[in-house]
Amino acid sequence: EYSNCGENEYYNQTTGLCQECPPCGPGEEPYLSCGYGTKDEDYGCVPCPAEKFSKGGYQICRRHKDCEGFFRATVLTPGDMENDAECGPCLPGYYMLENRPRNIYGMVCYSCLLAPPNTKECVG
């Protein structure tokens, strides 16, 4: 029965059972609806646009980390359709706080204007 199907399941009228919605591959996101018992006939997977990535499954494409603009860090590896960007050391004029817990993205770099004296990234 339709109502018994889960978030990523549709009701297969041939078998009379709930069936898993086809997952998308890395670098893709679902297009149109599938789940809770129904599946659009044109349900499918579309590519992530530029600056976004997805690991596949039912995940929508998410923006790459903005290493330079948001984290004030260098780009170690630029992101592609399948992978997030990886950030490297801080940009010139910025430093990383030691002994600070990483946030969900990793370390954030702070302006040398706010740095304690003799912060190595900010000397010279």
Epitope: P22, C24, E41, D42, P49, A50, M81
Partner: antibody, heavy 119, light 107 residues
Framework: EVPLEESGGGLVKPGGSRKLSCAAS????????MHWVRQAPEKGLEWIAY????????YYSDTVKGRFTISRDNAKNTLFLQMTSLRSEDTAMYYC????????????WGAGTTVTVSS | DIQMTQTTSSLSASLGDRVTISCRAS??????LNWYQQKPDGTVKLLIY???RIHSGVPSRFSGSGSGTDYSLTISNLEQEDIATYFC?????????FGGGTKLEIK
Amino acid sequence: EVPLEESGGGLVKPGGSRKLSCAASGFTFSDHGMHWVRQAPEKGLEWIAYISSGSSNVYYSDTVKGRFTISRDNAKNTLFLQMTSLRSEDTAMYYCARRELLRFYFDVWGAGTTVTVSS
Amino acid sequence: DIQMTQTTSSLSASLGDRVTISCRASQDIGNHLNWYQQKPDGTVKLLIYYTSRIHSGVPSRFSGSGSGTDYSLTISNLEQEDIATYFCQQGNTLPWTFGGGTKLEIK
């Protein structure tokens, strides 16, 4: 075995009608959306119609809307294109093409059938 | 409708050459770009889908790249069997549209 084979082409007078068929084999026809794409002599490819796997969704290009009808018979593994009010500019090679499962491109093409509209 | 433009309608190259065919969309198509090969006998085959993914059975000398409105198909080591016309196609917005084609010939 050829997965898609078109038939029904030929010479038609302007204003006339023609029905093209595309026989599918070697894959589960009822799982796939299907397209018609055409190519006028010495011109590029032109998408003209699409039908989803169970016929719920049907789309046409503006050039054929109201004149052409796409349909399918999943029991007979056959795709159709009913063409009416034909014009000289409809003269082309007509290809049927399969929509890849889950994705939005034409992954298998037939060899085409030629329609010539001329008096 | 989204217009797809292949500025080079014909291209002459030597066997073994690296050949690049370009395609431009009239608006951002977000990587919904596919490439097809049409042989002189009219046979059409999918080469590349979603900008850069090689369709099964297609030789690895074919590759695709691009984003936004600008895309390209590269053949790294041209072979005799690659003599054909190449079409780009956008699948982002109905109606799906093709470029005018680039005919590849041997010098």
